[in-house]
């Protein structure tokens, strides 16, 4: 049988002679040269040659493991005399053993990584990886060990994994942000003679909130005119924070001071400044200086850094209110006055009052805005603000007069104010009641006595406090011997009733009834209205069939026989 094992050969042999591989040998070989060894298969006769007498195999060329890691060849042993094989043809392996001819190569020439500042020692930063093309199954040619060439004492690298970690406590981004670390990967397990490669790792410390905001000055002073409307910015304050991004975001607030309710502070998100604004209307005459305590704080706190102290700072803000020449101020925002409609001209209705709010207390004069009183019904005393009538009033024409009064500083006519004045005209009983409509009714010739032929209604332009109370009666001159009667219903209506049985339209076709309507107010007002009654022929249902169109009217306005 064949006597061999697998053969091994070092790659990239550099000697001048052929490289010895091994020996083929059959136990049938008696050493007398009777056997002939034949080699075939991968690279036979080219890469590999055999001494046909001894079975010694040599490699004729420099081999490279990465071209083919294994060569499979066939061996034959033949009896020279008979030409017959003394062993079955068999295969064997020549395995090319790797020499360390490949340096470790990092997967990236430059790595970029970040780690939070102030991180604990041993915090993971990044893992670097180097690969080696040599055979990992043979020797240490591909066994890579990592070490740090540059970047100590700040960082360390795990020799087997390539994991870079922080190595120094309290690395402060605000002190130094960028680090360049050089890592070496060396094969042969890092031993002498190993091949190496390097990579650069650019490490940036990312920000954590380890710095509080700080005001660069303890006191700020701003001025603002008292006329500044709410929302007006007065000034800007800015606390500085050595951190960046959201860790440098600042919220401002007013924590104390006399003007806590008079001012606001808002944060400008772009500049991180605190903008002090007016919250309520200021008044120089009431308060001229405000002192506030403004606080700047970080909204995003990291609890582990609270031991460094409060993440806030405060400053004093002094606000000086500047005097502004202000227009006069009326004692009320509006005035409501009343006057009877029968008031005589020059009757005083009431008065308005305005005062200069400034410390100077400039005198004021009053006037009526004539655009609001075109008919010049009212006037005002320019000195004391008394309002009086300059024309007669009529409630029934206009119930309310809405006028505007102007107060102007005498020394500075540009400073003026206006106030609305609502004047209500009170009712006086100066109108008589009247019929609500023109009444023309009819009566059937065959009408019975006490029949209701018409209901009367009255109207009155006046508006008495207790409501209208009208009374109805026939005029005295028509009351006696009238063919009709008036029945006062005591509800501001009255009925006309027949007074006899039957009417003859041929005798009298039309009656004119004078009715007196009186009100119940003081002084009593009354009027006389006329009701026309026509006598008509009716059917047995009382439906009118024919009437005379006209009546005979006497100069007195009373019809004959009324």
């Amino acid at each position: 049988s064949w006597m061999w094992n697998q053969f091994f050969l070092l790659e990239e042999y550099t000697g001048s002679d052929y490289q010895y591989v091994g020996k083929l040998h059959s136990d049938q070989d008696r050493g007398d040269g009777s056997l002939k060894y034949i080699l075939s298969g991968d690279g036979a006769g080219d890469l590999f040659i055999i001494n046909e007498n001894t079975g010694d195999i040599q490699a004729t060329k420099r081999l490279d493991r990465e071209e083919k890691p294994v060569y499979i060849l066939r061996a034959q042993a033949i009896n020279r005399r008979t030409g017959r094989p003394v062993e079955p043809e068999s295969e064997f392996i020549i395995k090319i053993h790797d020499i360390n001819d490949n340096e470790p190569i990092f997967t990236k020439d430059v790595y970029t990584a970040t780690v939070p500042e102030m991180a604990d020692v041993g915090t993971f930063v990044v893992q670097v990886t180097a690969t080696d093309a040599d055979d990992p199954t043979y020797g240490n040619s591909a066994k890579v060990v990592y070490s740090i060439l540059q970047g100590q004492p700040y960082f360390s690298v795990e020799s087997e994994t390539g994991i870079i970690k922080t190595a120094l406590l309290n690395m402060d981004r605000e002190n130094r942000e960028q680090y360049q670390v050089v890592i070496q990967a060396k094969d042969m397990g890092g031993q002498m003679g190993g091949l190496s490669g390097t990579t650069t790792v650019n490490i940036t410390l990312t920000d954590v909130n380890d710095n509080p905001p700080r005001f660069p000055q303890s006191t700020y002073q701003f001025k603002t005119p008292e006329s500044s409307p709410p929302g007006t910015p007065i000034g800007r304050i800015k606390a500085s924070d050595a951190d960046v991004g959201e860790n440098a975001e600042i919220e401002y607030s007013i924590t104390d001071g006399e003007g806590h309710d008079m001012f606001d502070v808002i944060t400008d998100q772009e500049t991180q400044e605190g903008i002090i604004t007016v919250k309520k209307l200021l008044d120089f005459e009431k308060k001229r200086v405000y002192t506030l305590k403004v606080e700047a704080s970080n909204p995003h706190i990291e609890p582990r850094f609270l031991y460094l102290g409060p993440f806030k700072d405060s400053a004093t803000v002094r606000i000086v209110v500047d005097d502004v020449d202000e227009p006069p101020v009326f004692s009320k925002p509006a005035y409501i006055l009343q006057i009877r409609e029968d008031a005589q001209i020059n009757t005083t209705i009431g008065s308005v009052a305005a005062q200069d709010p400034d410390a100077a207390r400039n005198p004021v004069k009053y006037s009526v805005d004539r655009h609001t009183d075109m008919d010049r019904i009212f006037n005002i005393d320019s000195g004391n603000g008394s309002i009086f009538t300059s024309k007669l009033l009529d409630r029934e024409t206009l119930l309310w007069h809405n006028i505007t009064v102007i107060a102007t500083e005498i020394n500075n006519p540009k400073q003026s104010s206006r106030v609305p004045l609502y004047i209500k005209v009170l009712d006086v009983n100066d109108n008589a009641p009247e019929f609500a409509e023109f009444y023309e009714t009819f009566v059937c010739e065959k009408a019975k006595a006490d029949q209701l032929i018409q209901t009367l209604h009255a109207v009155d332009k006046d508006d008495p406090y207790s409501g209208h109370q009208f009374s109805f009666s026939l005029a005295p001159e028509a009351a006696s011997g009238s063919n009709f009667t008036i029945q006062d219903n005591k509800d501001n209506t009255a009925g006309i009733l027949t007074r006899k049985n039957g009417y003859n339209r041929h005798e009298m076709s039309t009656y004119l009834l004078p009715v007196v309507i009186s009100d119940n107010d003081y002084p009593v007002q009354s009027s006389t209205g006329t009701v026309t009654v026509r006598v008509c022929a009716c059917d047995h249902h009382g439906n009118m069939q024919s009437c005379h169109a006209e009546a005979l009217i006497h100069p007195t306005g009373l019809s004959t026989g009324a």
Partner: antibody, heavy 120, light 108 residues
Framework: QVQLLESGGGLVQPGGSLRLSCAAS????????MHWVRQAPGKGLEWVSF????????YYADSVKGRFTISRDNSKNTLYLQMNSLRAEDTAVYYC?????????????WGQGTLVTVSS | DIELTQPPSVSVSPGQTASITCSGD??????VHWYQQKPGQAPVLVIY???NRPSGIPERFSGSNSGNTATLTISGTQAEDEADYYC??????????FGGGTKLTVLG
């Protein structure tokens, strides 16, 4: 001329078995190492298995190890691939290819391929 | 173990030069072979041992291998060169590795 011709492909259920053959002609079959390579539909080439010229040495891709067996019968100039415990992911065209020392141990030539479909 | 990476596709105008890359760590230390596969056909060896042409392969096909990249170059590309191209090398022991393949499109 040098020729390789695969056969034995077809439809088989998951868990089933199939035996592929590759008939060689035009060269001394027993002098060459042989390989099986497969190609899933619309995908790239994937090496499957190797056998040395006399069949003493075999080698397999991890994806088929323990399920597939490569063998050869030099007297019949035929290469085989016995496929057991087939899975849906084994669906592919299977090529046999000759390893040619003269071409730096590259594959030349290749057979036309046989389609194996694993589906229920 | 080596891993071979190819671009999924490359486009070229007729007559222009097409370059298809195959990258892997220290690939220069490995022998690379290239195969051409047209639709419905078996692969064909076009370059062996980095830069050698088998008989019958046109001269416009050439190869190179250095650093981390092996390259198949087709100068004066023709319409019939439109195909999928695969690089291949030996991995550990007796295993073989292929690149993912590159589809070459000849425009026009």
């Amino acid at each position: 001329q040098v020729q390789l011709l695969e056969s034995g492909g077809g439809l088989v259920q998951p868990g089933g078995s199939l035996r592929l053959s590759c008939a060689a002609s035009g060269f001394t079959f027993s002098s060459y190492a042989m390989h099986w390579v497969r190609q899933a539909p619309g995908k790239g080439l994937e090496w499957v298995s190797f056998i040395s010229s006399l069949g003493s040495y075999t080698y397999y891709a991890d994806s088929v190890k323990g399920r597939f067996t490569i063998s050869r019968d030099n007297s019949k100039n035929t290469l085989y691939l016995q496929m057991n415990s087939l899975r849906a992911e084994d669906t592919a065209v299977y090529y046999c290819a000759r390893e040619t020392a003269g071409y730096g141990y590259a594959f030349d030539p290749w057979g036309q391929g046989t389609l194996v479909t694993v589906s229920s | 173990d080596i891993e071979l990476t190819q671009p999924p596709s490359v486009s070229v105008s007729p007559g222009q030069t097409a370059s298809i890359t195959c990258s892997g760590d220290n690939i220069r230390k490995y022998v690379v072979h290239w195969y051409q596969q047209k639709p419905g056909q078996a692969p064909v060896l076009v370059i062996y041992r980095d830069n050698n042409r088998p008989s019958g392969i046109p001269e416009r096909f050439s190869g190179s291998n250095s650093g981390n990249t092996a390259t198949l170059t087709i100068s004066g590309t023709q319409a019939e060169d439109e195909a999928d191209y695969y690089c291949q090398s030996w991995d550990s022991f007796l295993a073989v590795v292929f690149g993912g393949g590159t589809k070459l499109t000849v425009l026009g």
